[in-house]
């Protein structure tokens, strides 16, 4: 039975020294930067148990930046998980084999040299392959502050099997009250996934008014369960300008 060896390949160690200088002039300092940001766009990784996770933060800078990893904002050491992990400095990656539910969390790469520091966070969820409740990427939708008359885009990143139903809701007031007689908040349905809804994960508001300030909710459900995350919209306006409040028919958020 072939068992994995604990040793890393020498080729993967980042043992490169600073660039050789042909004269006495030092190379221009460069703060760290991402070399392939398009390969870092997938932030939410929902992975079945026992599979391998690889997070990459390809970077560069002068002098060569260092790479370290945090889990949930704290120093991440190999003995923090069964089986440890491998850092491949040459490819700016971390590899965790045979993931288990306790590996769930936020993993942050920090790339730094004496001229700057950059970081990027990935979200790992360890899932059952059988149908599960929807999972939403942390931090989305994000709070927005915009000027009166601007356009606004809220985004909700969803991972779901089976097919999810996505709703965008806004918390509203009815007769000065935010809560209905059944103790549920009043909400207005702004958008939902369906035949006429393209790109349900995005809510776009055009030419916003002050009345559209408030809390917006991305609510995602399937037959297993549901998840929701919210964000606040703040619309700023010049002084002395008043806008009438818009009243719409209320619904309850269950």
């Amino acid at each position: 039975d072939a068992l994995p060896s604990s040793e890393d390949d020498d080729d993967d160690d980042d043992s490169s020294s600073e660039e050789k200088e042909t004269d006495n002039t030092k190379p221009n300092p460069v703060a760290p930067y991402w070399t392939s940001p398009e390969k870092m766009e997938k932030k939410l990784h929902a992975v079945p148990a026992a599979k391998t996770v690889k997070f990459k933060c390809p970077s560069s800078g002068t002098p060569n930046p260092t790479l370290r990893w945090l889990k949930n904002g704290k120093e991440f050491k190999p003995d923090h998980r069964i089986g440890g992990y491998k850092v491949r400095y040459a490819t700016w990656s971390i590899i965790m084999d045979s993931v288990v539910p306790s590996d769930k969390g936020n993993y942050t790469c920090i790339v730094e040299n004496e001229y700057g520091s950059i970081n990027h966070t990935y979200q790992l969820d360890v899932v059952e392959r059988s149908p599960h409740r929807p999972i939403l990427q942390a931090g989305l939708p994000a709070n927005k502050t915009v000027a009166l008359g601007s356009n606004v885009e809220f985004m909700c990143k969803v991972y779901s099997d089976p097919q999810p139903h996505i709703q965008w809701l806004k918390h509203i007031e009815v007769n000065g009250s935010k809560i209905g007689p059944d103790n549920l908040p009043y909400v207005q349905i702004l958008k939902h996934s369906g035949i006429n809804s393209s790109d349900a994960e995005v809510l776009t508001l055009f030419n916003v008014t002050e009345a559209q300030s408030g809390e917006y909710v991305c609510k995602v459900s399937n037959y297993i369960g549901e998840a929701n995350q919210s964000a606040w919209l703040t619309v700023t306006r010049p002084a002395l300008e008043e806008r009438p409040a818009v009243m719409t028919s209320p619904l309850y958020l269950e």
């Epitope: 994995p4 026992a50 599979k51 045979s98």
Partner: antibody, heavy 116, light 109 residues
Framework: QVQLQESGPGLVKPSGTLSLTCAVS?????????WSWVRQPPGKGLEWIGE???????SYNPSLKSRVTISVDKSKNQFSLKLSSVTAADTAVYYC?????????WGQGTLVTVSS | SYVLTQPPSVSVAPGQTARITCGGN??????VHWYQQKPGQAPVLVVY???DRPSGIPERFSGSNSGNTATLTISRVEAGDEADYYC???????????FGGGTKLTVLG
């Protein structure tokens, strides 16, 4: 060390159902592994059929999904493959295997011929 | 679904270095595993997680993975290395295990 042994009929009639079982010895089927079936038609490459976790969670090759069922029997420490509506194109050596992201243990394989 | 592309055959003289490639869209973001299969035998894992070797596999076998290509390198090739070699990934997007089409390594002479 873990060992895997495939068993089942070596000849199946067209339109029938291919049924194979993989006995796991030297380890528990409830370990943090996926239990896979992989096949290899004569003179061709490896084709992943599907896999199962001890919880019963499964994943199947999309090209075979409508015909495949993989199940696990923890009490017998074994897992099974059923492939329905077989044709001559399903003639292959069938391997059971244990893996995570990669496969570290394979059975020796069993040749299944589809013929009338 | 995800596709892995391997050259059908690679030939090399004994003592030389053989390189077998495995192409896939942004494969560098995945962990690539390599298997050796000799005629009439089950496959054997020779490299996992891009470049790690299981115990018992000679140091002559090494791997790398970047961009759209993963590579299995066999240095100081021996006659006993003649076999079919397959790359494999677990495609995280489709949640499926995927094999490359295989490469037949021929050791000349």
């Amino acid at each position: 060390q873990v060992q895997l042994q495939e068993s089942g009929p070596g000849l199946v009639k067209p339109s029938g159902t291919l049924s194979l079982t993989c006995a796991v010895s030297g380890g528990s089927i409830s370990s943090n592994n996926w239990w896979s079936w992989v096949r290899q038609p004569p003179g061709k490459g490896l084709e992943w059929i599907g896999e199962i976790y001890h919880s019963g969670s499964t994943s199947y090759n999309p090209s075979l999904k409508s015909r495949v069922t993989i199940s696990v029997d923890k009490s017998k420490n074994q897992f099974s493959l059923k492939l329905s509506s077989v044709t001559a194109a399903d003639t292959a050596v069938y391997y059971c295997a244990r893996g995570t992201d990669w496969i570290d243990t394979w059975g020796q394989g069993t040749l299944v011929t589809v013929s009338s | 679904s995800y596709v892995l592309t391997q050259p059908p055959s690679v030939s090399v003289a004994p003592g030389q270095t053989a390189r077998i490639t495995c192409g896939g869209n942004n494969i560098g973001s995945e962990s690539v595993h390599w298997y050796q299969q000799k005629p009439g035998q089950a496959p054997v894992l020779v490299v996992y997680d891009d470049s790690d070797r299981p115990s018992g596999i000679p140091e002559r076998f090494s791997g790398s993975n970047s961009g759209n290509t993963a590579t299995l390198t066999i240095s100081r090739v021996e006659a006993g290395d003649e076999a079919d070699y397959y790359c494999q990934v677990w495609d995280s997007t489709s949640d499926h295990r995927v094999f490359g089409g295989g490469t037949k390594l021929t050791v000349l002479g």
